[in-house]
């Protein structure tokens, strides 16, 4: 049903009124305001911004706006003892040192408290040794090195280029390979798009630019010292030795000028193939160690960062629902940045601010949403999704009973080519219907819908005439809501053309050059893409909070479950002999998917026909829809990842950013041919099929008629 049937509705107070109130000029103004100084988590500046947002959300008209604080483990460089990397000669003299910080961008020369590039949560240490170049440090890169090239990384310092996978996975892989240190760098092949100038004359990364970022492997734990529970005033904290996800070897990031100096001397093995070569004028030799004349020189890391328990602040705003105040639709994005946060996160925070202002305007005119909307400005996302996770841990009982949906609102843009959406299949139809009603901001699509330009530029690989919608992975604040609590979640932003731009993310990601001017001059001068993202995110929240029947279609889940079952079966069928030997069958899973499909179809028919004027039946049907995502949660979690509990989706074990389907089965099958005990390994595959089949069947039954 249309949103117009929601409460206290007048013709003026519908989705159109909400969308019409969103203004590009306001988003621009808010972005400027949020990006003039750094807002690093745990700093006074970020606390002041939290209080400013609290005050402004109250002025905008929310019913209440509170700060929720937690004391979590953060990481900072030592101000008097900077981190750097050296090349040392045989006498131990430092003959080359990497930069201590990035040259500041024009207009920001006198800004204080710019944190120098560092890898958050790196342990202290001064390892020295030979260098090994490990490409992107992916699982497959280490397989290539160790299995094919017979290169041993044990006791070596490895240098890896950023890109392809989450940096924490790189560090974990290096640790498992026995490395004693990791140097991360941005290669121009990944962070310098051809034909574009470097900042401040374009959106490319200068040679002195460096990507900051955390290197944790939290697997959804939140604060490393209080996994599973909020880091509140009476929290019991683990000792640092028992903390979750901390790296055990020193790690440090550098730019491509400094990387050139390290890589140009590399000797040893040649790169195995062209996929290991970047764009620097170096041989990309793997090592170990330097070539001929330089073979006595070593690399030494000097890392002095410290881990500190520090107070962080979320801002939580409430717009109470008129009919179902105990049903929560959440819009959340983070506020903390590495430096200025021109894109990450403030392009998202500015959009949230304008969405709150628009909802507040409607509320001041007498309107209320049907369901409660919660708005969140999360802290310490950059340090491991800490603010959102701690708040969700503190409120988990409420959320698991009342949480309808979570819409994430980090960076609004990572390009200006087309829309990018990742969400639960329950939201596919909502996103399709909404984007058909919105105007495309794209050149050449004047007067056309957003759906049309999106579908043209980013077509679905499976369904013609439909746009691509991706699986949710992690690396952002939806993680705890979706992967741990099973609350239907989605995210949307404008993105680049992935076909022509092969670089990873956007070039200036997490560097000092991510400024307001970067956005205003190069990405979105008219802020029309920001406005479109505001309309998508805000429109989704509006519909989720206001539709009489929740805008979820369970049939879309049935479709993807079949696709995922086919995919995982195909992977398993690469081992036909073992499947036969160990009696591995997917029959139970396919049967459960078939049952789910049939039950979902019948449920959808009932959804069309039931008496929507009966509040009890309406609530019952909506609850079945709301709790469907919850039904995919296994309370025991995935093996060795207790906070990843969704059986259908989890962040890839090899790349936190990517989503994996049927992750339990996938991980059990991964590299199974190398397992020392095949019987045990295939037994785990069978167990995971059983868990998946049971879960799908159990979820299907939540959609059956209740009696």
């Amino acid at each position: 049903k249309s949103s117009n049937e929601a409460t206290n509705i007048t013709p003026k107070h519908n989705m159109k009124a909400f969308l019409d109130e969103l203004k590009a000029e306001n988003i621009k103004k808010f972005l400027y305001n949020f990006t003039q100084i750094p807002h690093l988590a745990g700093t006074e500046q970020n606390f002041q911004l939290a209080k400013q947002i609290q005050s402004q959300w109250k002025e905008f008209g929310l019913d209440s706006v509170e700060l929720a604080h937690y004391d979590v483990l953060l990481s900072y460089p030592n101000k008097t003892h900077p981190n750097y990397i050296s090349i040392i000669n045989e006498d131990g003299n430092e003959i080359f040192n990497t930069s201590l910080f990035e040259p500041p961008p024009p207009g920001y020369e006198n800004v204080s408290d710019i944190v120098p590039p560092f890898s958050a949560f790196s342990p202290q240490g001064m390892p020295e040794g030979d260098l090994v170049y490990v490409n992107y440090a992916r699982t497959e890169d280490f397989f290539k090195l160790e299995r094919d090239m017979k290169i041993n990384c044990s006791g070596k310092i490895v240098i890896a280029r950023y890109g392809k996978v989450f940096r924490g996975n790189k560090v974990k892989n290096a640790q498992l390979a026995g490395a004693k240190g990791v140097i991360l760098y941005s290669d121009p092949a990944d962070y310098f798009a051809p034909g574009v100038k470097s900042y401040p004359d374009g959106w490319n990364l200068p040679g002195g630019g460096v990507q900051r970022g955390n290197i944790l492997n939290l697997n959804g734990a939140g604060d490393p010292l209080t996994p599973g529970y909020p880091a509140n005033e009476y929290a019991y904290r683990r000792g640092i030795a028992e903390a979750v996800g901390l790296p055990s070897i020193p790690v440090h990031p550098i730019g491509y000028y400094d990387a050139q100096k390290l890589l140009e001397k590399m000797g040893g093995s040649a790169p195995p193939d062209s996929s290991w070569r970047g764009s620097l004028k170096v041989p990309y030799n793997v090592g170990p160690g330097f070539t001929g004349n330089f073979s006595t020189q070593k690399v030494k890391m000097h890392i002095h960062s410290t881990n500190e328990v520090t107070r962080i602040y979320n801002v939580i705003g409430t717009l109470r629902g008129a009919v179902e105040p105990d049903r929560y639709v959440i819009l959340g994005g983070h506020r903390d940045s590495w430096v200025f946060g021109g894109i990450d996160p403030q392009s998202g925070a500015a959009v949230v601010h304008e969405i709150v202002r628009s909802f507040g305007t409607l509320k001041k005119e007498g309107w209320r949403p049907r369901r409660t909307i919660l708005f969140a400005s999360w802290d310490a996302e950059e340090f491991g999704l800490l603010g959102s996770t701690e708040w969700a841990e503190e409120n988990s009982r409420l959320l698991q009973e009342r949480g309808v949906a979570y819409i994430n609102a980090d960076s609004s843009i990572e390009g200006n080519y087309t829309l990018r959406v990742d969400c639960t299949p329950l939201m596919y139809s909502l996103v399709h219907n909404l984007t058909k009603e919105l105007k495309s901001p794209d050149e050449g699509f004047e007067g056309k819908s957003l759906y049309e330009s999106w579908t043209k530029k980013s077509p679905s690989p499976e369904f013609s005439g439909m746009p691509r919608i991706s699986k949710l992975g992690s690396g952002n604040d939806f993680e705890v809501f979706f992967q741990r609590l099973g609350i239907a979640s989605g995210r949307a932003r404008y993105t680049k053309n992935w076909e022509t731009n092969k670089f990873s993310g956007y070039p200036l990601y997490h560097s000092v050059y991510e400024t307001y001017e970067l956005v205003e001059k190069f990405y979105d001068p008219m802020f029309k893409y920001h406005l479109t993202v505001a309309q998508v995110r805000g429109g989704m929240v509006f519909e989720l909070a206001n539709s009489i029947v929740l805008p979820f279609d369970c049939r879309d889940y049935a479709v993807v479950l079949r696709k995922y079952a086919d995919k995982i079966y195909s992977i398993s069928m690469k081992h036909p002999q073992e499947m036969k030997t160990y009696s591995v069958s997917f029959d139970s899973l396919f049967s459960a998917v078939k049952n789910f499909t049939e039950i979902a179809s019948k449920f959808s028919e009932r959804l069309q026909d039931f008496d929507k004027s009966n509040p009890i039946v309406l609530r019952m049907m909506n609850d079945q829809l709301m709790f469907l995502e919850r039904a995919f949660i296994d309370p025991l979690g995935l093996p060795d990842r207790p906070f990843y509990r969704h059986v259908i989706y989890a962040p890839s074990s090899h790349n936190k950013y990517a989503g994996e389907s049927f992750p339990g089965i996938y991980d059990a099958l991964f590299d199974i041919e190398s397992k020392v005990d095949p019987s045990k390994a295939w037994g785990e595959v069978k167990r995971q099929i059983y868990v998946a089949a049971f879960t799908v069947q159990a979820a299907a039954e939540t959609l059956s008629e209740v009696a």
Epitope: I95, N97, P103, P104, K197, D201, P206, G207, Y257, K261
Partner: antibody, heavy 120, light 106 residues
Framework: EVQLVESGGGLVQPGGSMRLSCAAS????????MAWVRQAPGKGLEWIAN????????YYADSLKGRFTISRDNSKNTLYLQMNSLRAEDTAVYYC?????????????WGQGTTVTVSS | DIQLTQSPSSLSASVGDRVTITCRAS?????IYWYQQKPGKAPKPWIY???NLASGVPSRFSGSGSGTDYTLTISSLQPEDFATYYC?????????FGQGTKLEIK
């Protein structure tokens, strides 16, 4: 051969104006930031101004802002420095220089310099 | 603005001597550049990004340092090395130069 040749120097009275030119050859002019640097007699080097690839952004030493204007004509491979309200302390050798790496570059190619004398 | 102070301002040395010129910044910079200038001539780029020798610069020259303290070293002074050397920072606008170190024959 990469070359920068300055011209336009000479004697000028205090309060007067002068325009210096720098002709570039041997490289793709529009691919580089350019700069002016000066050196007073018997003194050290002083950066005056920078200009980006297409002339859309200019950067000046605070002490000279408002009196000096840097510009370029990429079609003529020429850099300019317009100097107004000249003072005796502006007497110096003026060098045109190429920035090696955009905004953050250093000066990797220098002209031979042109002498400006401000005197009555 | 970042001030660069070179020491010594002038230095008398003999052919074959090892010579070190220092450049101290008023606040931390990521790199220093060095130029050589001979009388009546334009400066020449000599060392870039602290430790990289410009094209044609002999290997007896080396550069090192980080933060606020940088050095240019000549391992064995040759007759053609007598000149004035300037350090420069291009880290924080505006670009600034040291006052110069004049290297003279003893």
């Amino acid at each position: 051969e990469v070359q920068l040749v300055e011209s336009g120097g000479g004697l000028v009275q205090p309060g007067g104006s002068m325009r210096l030119s720098c002709a570039a050859s041997g490289f793709t002019f529009s691919d580089y930031y350019m700069a002016w640097v000066r050196q007073a007699p018997g003194k050290g080097l002083e950066w005056i101004a920078n200009i980006n690839y297409d002339g859309s952004n200019t950067y000046y030493a605070d002490s000279l802002k408002g009196r000096f204007t840097i510009s370029r004509d990429n079609s003529k491979n020429t850099l300019y420095l317009q100097m107004n309200s000249l003072r005796a302390e502006d007497t110096a050798v003026y060098y045109c220089a190429r920035n090696w790496d955009g905004y953050y570059g250093y000066f990797d190619v220098w002209g031979q310099g042109t002498t400006v004398t401000v005197s009555s | 603005d970042i001030q660069l102070t070179q020491s010594p301002s002038s230095l008398s040395a003999s052919v074959g001597d090892r010579v070190t010129i220092t450049c101290r910044a008023s606040s931390s910079v990521s790199h220093i550049y060095w130029y050589q200038q001979k009388p009546g001539k334009a400066p020449k780029p000599w060392i870039y990004r602290t430790s990289n020798l410009a094209s044609g610069v002999p290997s007896r020259f080396s550069g090192s340092g980080s933060g606020t303290d940088y050095t240019l070293t000549i391992s064995s002074l040759q007759p053609e090395d007598f000149a004035t050397y300037y350090c420069q920072q291009y880290h924080t606008y505006p670009p600034t130069f040291g006052q110069g170190t004049k290297l003279e024959i003893k």
